[in-house]
């Protein structure tokens, strides 16, 4: 267990040219607020997805009412670092967002007004206990500064607050293969006791007693590797004799989900839907209205008009979700007709159309022949939103300008040899065969396999194919 | 548009049973508490009972007059909300309105139960 | 068990602004009572007006308007029409119990 902890220092224009205008005036004056989100790894996740490893909430900071005619300067900032805790392992990985949001405190009916000013974004490996990182990020014309640690919370240690301290037994040195808890060196590290039996190749623990099993191992012990090709089931520890898995526990067993909240599988671990008004890993965070800032991605809070509707999002376009924390798939619908390909671009959704199609949605078959001539006499064919010309005699090529080479596919078999002729192709054929593209051999006796050849043509004669 | 149907009032002799019923269509009728208020003839309104959804457990709450004989319920699948009303009582006599609070609040049109000898 | 306490009748002018109050017996009203409004208008046709104290309902004209003044909650009607003749009920929300107050009566003439 630990914290993270993330201190702004500052917010305002960033250098270079297009300073942006000032977010409160005289008319309307505001203050500004930060909300944080921690994902665990280095994962390139969007920003509506849960904020796995904790989200935290700044204080409103000093009222500010721009002078007119001046250029925005820093933004006053609120007091105090924001907090996450973390209750399990500090990841080393993690990803951020860190919003700042306006609060506008005109005098509009219903309350003051929120809106998202910037949204930056960064992947970092930190390892817990080490010192102040610092960061600069820039969003559009704005630059935010902080800093940021996470540090364990006694009596976990170390770089994961895995490792576990404890105040030394003797007054001079730690116990067998135990060494001092840095800095605390008055304290000794604590041997983290799994449960008996938890593999030491496959399973790990964060807690005394547990037994956490890695990626691709299950059981009580994590001795029982993941096969699920012939199983029903997607978890437990493994059948004696099939060597399948049966139903085990799972990570939704006893529903760690706090106040009503739903929980869902995950590959690696659980997610829960929290109802409205609560939030959190677990949706342990509770007593949520506007003030707490819940909608996310620009979502507009309204408050709710009952206990259970304590707040209400209004999410923007391709956001759904009680917070607007989910963003919608919109292509999943197949908006795109005729096999078109789906963008979602966030603001709106694009069709990038096959050839032979236009529309927003593809939805319109163009007249493919419409003002494409075939040479030569050839005649146009409409399909699949391409045109063809089907070429007469002699002719070929995506719109029957080419003449055709009509011996270039070596028609005539068995060694004819092909002539080109203005209807088609000629085949004189080898001593023994016969046929317009000579694929009949001359029985030994004379005979033709074929029956009697046409007047005037002996067997062995060029057979002109028509 | 957001619709509550109310159906099941009728005439009922006092210590008579009724069932109210209430289709809800367009909004996603699992997510929110469900509620019945009344308004007896030429009086104010008074409210009844409520549901919460399944992520609070169904958890139901009644006005102190009503208890321990109406029963407020729900069928998320059919998106239906019922008030089973037994030993029922002159004072019972009223319009029966489902209603649903979200940003503001959502009426049906009522069903009307007399209680009458 | 909380007491809803409204003005049992107003009267006012067409053009005129308005205020209905609601009062709760245990103490100021605040946001967590989701003070609500309701118009009712003749043939039970009733009309949800304002909720969460200050969301207007889509459609309800932007003359009505919900707030918190001092310890009641209020509704302002500013440039009253005629056709706002009606009974407005508002409810305040104790945890899972909801109170209606009385009514107000109001008149425009």
């Known amino acids: 267990a630990g914290v993270f902890e993330l201190q702004i220092h500052s917010f305002g224009p960033g250098p270079g040219p297009g300073a942006p205008r000032s977010p409160c005036s005289a008319r309307l004056p505001c203050r500004l607020f930060f909300r944080v989100c921690l994902k665990p790894g280095l994962s390139e996740e969007a920003a509506e997805s849960p904020c796995a490893l904790g989200a935290a909430l700044s204080a409103r900071g000093p009222v500010y009412t721009e002078q007119p005619g001046a250029p925005a300067p820093d933004l006053p900032l609120p007091d105090g670092l924001l907090q996450v805790p973390f209750r399990d392992a500090w990841p080393g990985t993690f990803s951020f967002i860190i919003e700042t949001w306006r609060e506008e405190l005109g005098d509009q009916i219903g309350g003051p007004a929120w809106s998202l000013l910037a949204r930056v974004a960064g992947r970092r490996r930190l390892a817990a206990g080490g010192p102040w990182a610092r960061d600069i990020q820039r969003a559009g014309a704005w630059e935010l500064r902080f800093s940021y640690r996470a540090r364990c919370e006694p009596p976990a240690v170390g770089t994961a607050c895995t490792r576990l301290c404890r105040p030394r037994s003797a007054p001079s040195r730690c116990g067998p293969g135990l060494r001092p808890c840095a800095p605390l060196e008055d304290e000794c590290e604590a041997p983290l006791v799994c449960r008996a039996g938890c593999s030491p190749e496959h399973g790990f623990c964060e807690q005394p007693g547990e037994c956490r099993c890695l990626e691709g191992w299950t059981g009580p012990l994590c001795t029982v590797p993941v096969s699920t090709s012939s199983c029903l089931s997607p978890r437990g520890p493994s059948s004696a004799t099939t060597g399948c898995l049966v139903p085990g526990p799972g990570p939704c067993d006893g529903n760690p989900c706090a106040n009503g909240g739903s929980c869902s599988e995950t590959p690696r671990s659980f997610e829960c839907t929290c109802p409205r008004g609560f939030y959190g890993l677990r949706c342990e965070v509770s007593g949520v209205t506007c003030a707490d800032g819940p909608c996310f991605n620009g979502g507009l809070c309204v408050g709710g008009a009952d206990p259970d509707s304590a707040y209400i999002c209004h999410c923007p376009p391709g956001f759904q979700g009680s917070n607007c924390e989910k963003r919608v798939d919109r292509c999943s619908l197949q908006p795109c007709r005729n096999g078109g390909l789906c963008l979602d671009l966030g603001h709106a959704l694009r069709c990038r159309c096959r050839a032979g199609f236009a529309g927003p949605r593809c939805e319109h078959d163009l007249d493919d022949c419409a003002g494409r001539a075939c040479a030569n006499g050839g005649t146009c064919v409409e399909g699949g939103g391409a045109h063809r010309c089907s070429c007469a005699l002699g002719f070929g090529g995506r719109d029957c300008r080419e003449r055709a080479d009509p011996c270039a596919a070596r028609p005539c078999a068995h060694g004819g040899r092909c002539y080109a002729h203005f209807s088609g192709l000629v085949c004189a054929c080898a001593p023994g065969y016969m046929g317009a593209r000579c694929e009949f051999p001359v029985h030994p006796d004379g005979a033709s396999a074929l029956p009697a050849a046409p007047p005037g043509l002996r067997p062995g004669d060029p057979q002109r194919y028509l | 548009e957001v619709q509550l149907v109310e159906t099941g009032g009728g005439l009922v002799q006092p210590k008579g049973s009724l069932k109210l019923s209430c289709a809800v269509s367009?909004?996603?009728?699992?997510?929110?508490?469900m509620n019945w208020v009344r308004q007896a003839p030429g009086k104010g309104l008074e409210w009844v009972a409520r549901?919460?959804?399944?992520?609070?457990?169904?958890?139901?709450y009644y006005a102190d007059s009503v208890k321990d004989r109406f029963t407020i319920s729900r069928d998320d699948s059919q998106s239906m909300l019922y008030l089973q009303m037994n030993n029922l009582k002159i004072e019972d006599t009223a319009m029966y309105y489902c209603?649903?609070?979200?940003?503001?609040?959502?009426w049906g049109q009522g069903t009307l139960v007399t209680v009458s000898a | 068990q909380a007491v809803v306490t409204q003005e049992s009748a107003l009267t006012t002018s067409p053009g005129e602004t308005v205020t209905l109050t609601c009062r709760s017996s245990?103490?100021?009203?605040?946001?967590?009572?989701?003070a609500n409004w309701i118009q009712e208008k003749p043939d039970h046709l009733f009309t949800g007006l304002i909720g969460?104290?200050?969301n207007r309902a889509p459609g309800v004209p932007a003359r009505f308007s919900g707030s918190l003044i001092g310890d009641k909650a209020a509704l302002t009607i500013t440039g009253a029409q005629t056709e706002d003749e009606a009974i407005y009920f508002c409810?305040?929300?104790?945890?899972?119990?909801?109170?209606f107050g009385g009514g107000t009566k109001l008149t425009v003439l």
């Open positions: 209603v649903f609070y979200y940003d503001y609040v959502y």
């Open positions: 367009a909004f996603t009728f699992t997510t929110y508490a």
């Open positions: 549901i919460r959804n399944k992520s609070n457990n169904y958890a139901t």
């Open positions: 245990t103490g100021a009203v605040t946001t967590s009572n989701y």
């Open positions: 969460g104290t200050h």
């Open positions: 409810g305040l929300w104790y945890s899972n119990h909801l109170v």
